[in-house]
């Protein structure tokens, strides 16, 4: 005859304060004759949690009817869980005896612990923007979870990152724990539309991790490239000069034209377009009057991007004799 086995399937049971905990225990044999009792802890000081035959256990109910003849399920429910209920619970088979029933076999035990879900991860980026090819740090924090075991991963656009450091505090026993992780991310020029994700997995989340995100658009500054060109065609006695400011982020941009070192106050036409990668292009047109007296015109397009030092591009206007003739012909 096969020897009785006491089956307690869960090694760990996470419960929430105020809720009901179910502790499972089944036996594989009806023999030997005798009761199954529940204890918390081991050793001489173990605490009796449930005894069907005697005692008053107002918070404990059985899952099955223990009076049924062939019952092999000795699972119990404990209601209104408090922090004082944590510990390891054992279902123990006793052999009928006199003057006392004799302990025959114990289950492996189920550890009841207070489970608390981690808070939604909060991801914070750097205080100031940084240009591509540089490294920025992101921090992720989540609090209030228990037990201590937790897994944190970082992703950039779905690709897992490896350069990060994580700490869980406190190191000793506690009612609840916090996690803080710092990831180092190298910025790419196309990262305006990129995201970093901090993913936290915990036993209380039942396989559905929590995520916190940060947009790299908050952390990146893509400096513009400038190009100043003279349009081949002229309109009357005016030449059209274009300043193209390409691939910059964020949008914050100040553009000024100078003619021979003098800042021009007059209105200029301009357009702003957004690129697929989230950067911007800005095109500004400047009309220059051409006359016989204007031999050497140097135009400067100066751009101040996102509070950084101004960058500029110069263009020496090429006014051909033919153009001058045309312009004088056009003069009334």
């Amino acid at each position: 005859e096969e020897e009785l086995q006491m089956i307690q399937p869960e090694k760990l049971l996470l419960v929430t304060v105020g809720k009901t905990a179910t502790l499972h225990c089944t036996v594989t044999s009806l023999l030997p004759v005798g009761p199954v009792l529940w204890f918390r802890g081991v050793g001489p000081g173990r605490e009796l949690i449930y005894n069907q035959k005697e005692g008053h256990f107002p918070r404990v109910t059985t899952v099955s009817d223990l009076t049924k003849r062939n019952n092999m399920d000795f699972s119990i429910r404990i209601s209104s869980i408090t922090p004082a209920d944590v510990g390891t619970y054992y279902c123990v088979k006793f052999r009928k005896g006199s003057p006392e029933n004799v302990e025959f076999k114990s289950g492996p035990g189920t550890e009841m612990a207070l489970g608390a879900k981690p808070s939604a991860p909060v991801v914070l980026g750097p205080a100031a923007r940084t240009t591509p090819e540089h490294t920025v740090s992101f921090t992720c924090e989540s609090h209030g979870f228990s037990p201590r075991d937790i897994t944190l991963k970082w992703f950039k656009n779905g690709n897992e990152l490896s350069d990060f450091q994580t700490n869980v505090d406190p190191t000793g026993q506690s009612v609840a724990y916090s996690i803080r992780s710092t990831a180092r991310v190298v910025l790419d020029p196309w990262d305006v539309r990129s995201q970093v994700i901090c993913e936290v997995a915990h036993v209380t989340l039942q396989g559905d991790p929590l995520r916190g995100t940060a947009n790299l658009s908050e952390a990146i500054r893509v400096p513009p490239t400038l190009e100043v060109t003279q349009q081949p065609m002229r309109v009357g006695n005016q030449v059209n000069v274009t300043c193209q400011v390409r691939k910059f982020y964020p949008q914050s941009l100040q553009l000024t034209w100078s003619e021979n070192g003098n800042v021009c106050q007059r209105e200029t036409a301009s357009t702003l377009t957004e690129n697929k990668d989230g950067t911007y292009n800005w095109t500004s047109w400047f009309l220059v009057n051409i006359s016989d007296q204007r031999d050497d015109v140097v135009l400067t397009c100066q751009v101040k991007h996102d509070g950084q030092l101004a960058v500029s591009k110069r263009l020496a206007l090429e006014v051909t004799v033919h153009q001058k003739d045309q312009s004088s012909d056009a003069t009334p």
Epitope: V42, G43, P44, R46, G97, S98, V102, E103, F104, S106
Partner: antibody, heavy 121, light 107 residues
């Protein structure tokens, strides 16, 4: 085969303590309660108490409460019985005995060889 | 505590004799009674448990009966190795108690 091997004879002065060991072998130590029974010279058998080797829980005869301490060491499959405040009437052979597996009535199917404790000034 | 008495306290018998030892409890102990045999300088040996069940390895000439307060150990045909002291023990309640013993010697 099941064996209970006890420590050797002891001579103690009144007021002292004695600790008798009982090493079990040949079975799963934690599965059977171990009882202690003593027998004064030329007298009958007297039950002192028992220990559950699995939990360490004990049950002691009222006569010996406060004087008897029963402990176990599962790593060495050994139970111990310590009797304190010894007096001359504690002179006896002390037996450890294994609680049987089959009977409903608490009965002892294997016994140690006995340890003679002599209390004399 | 439950008191156990045995009678006779001693008896002399010959090999082949049928020997009967009685044990009485001071209150009902159902069938929670065991019998032991002890030889000088040796530990007791379990013969009968639960009043009438023969312990494994014990010769069938030993038998037990009774319930409640009155119990009997019978040796159907006494053998030379049976000369010893016999104790009854109750297991109805704590503390476990033994009878004073019955010494069986050679006539």
């Amino acid at each position: 085969q099941v064996q209970l091997v006890q420590s050797g004879a002891e001579v103690k002065k009144p007021g002292a303590s004695v600790k008798v060991s009982c090493k079990a072998s040949g079975y799963t130590f934690t599965r059977n309660y171990v009882h202690w029974v003593r027998q004064a010279p030329g007298q009958g058998l007297e039950w002192m108490g028992r220990i559950n080797p699995n939990s360490g829980g004990t049950n002691t005869a009222q006569k010996f409460q406060g004087r008897v301490t029963m402990t176990r060491d599962t790593s060495t499959s050994t139970v111990y019985m310590e009797l304190s405040s010894l007096r001359s009437e504690d002179t006896a052979v002390y037996y450890c005995a294994r609680l049987g597996d089959v009977a409903v009535a608490a009965s002892f199917d294997y016994w140690g060889q006995g340890t003679l404790v002599t209390v004399s000034s | 505590d439950i008191q156990m008495t045995q009678s006779p306290s001693s008896l002399s018998a010959s090999v082949g004799d049928r020997v009967t030892i009685t044990c009485r409890a001071s209150q009902s102990i159902s069938s929670y009674l065991n019998w032991y045999q002890q030889k000088p300088g040796k530990a007791p040996k379990l013969l009968i448990y639960d009043a009438s069940s023969l312990e494994s390895g014990v010769p069938s000439r030993f038998s037990g009966s009774g319930s409640g307060t009155d119990f009997t150990l019978t040796i159907s045909s006494l053998q030379p190795e049976d000369f010893a002291t016999y104790y009854c023990q109750q297991a109805n309640s704590f503390p476990l108690t033994f009878g004073p013993g019955t010494k069986v010697d050679i006539k």
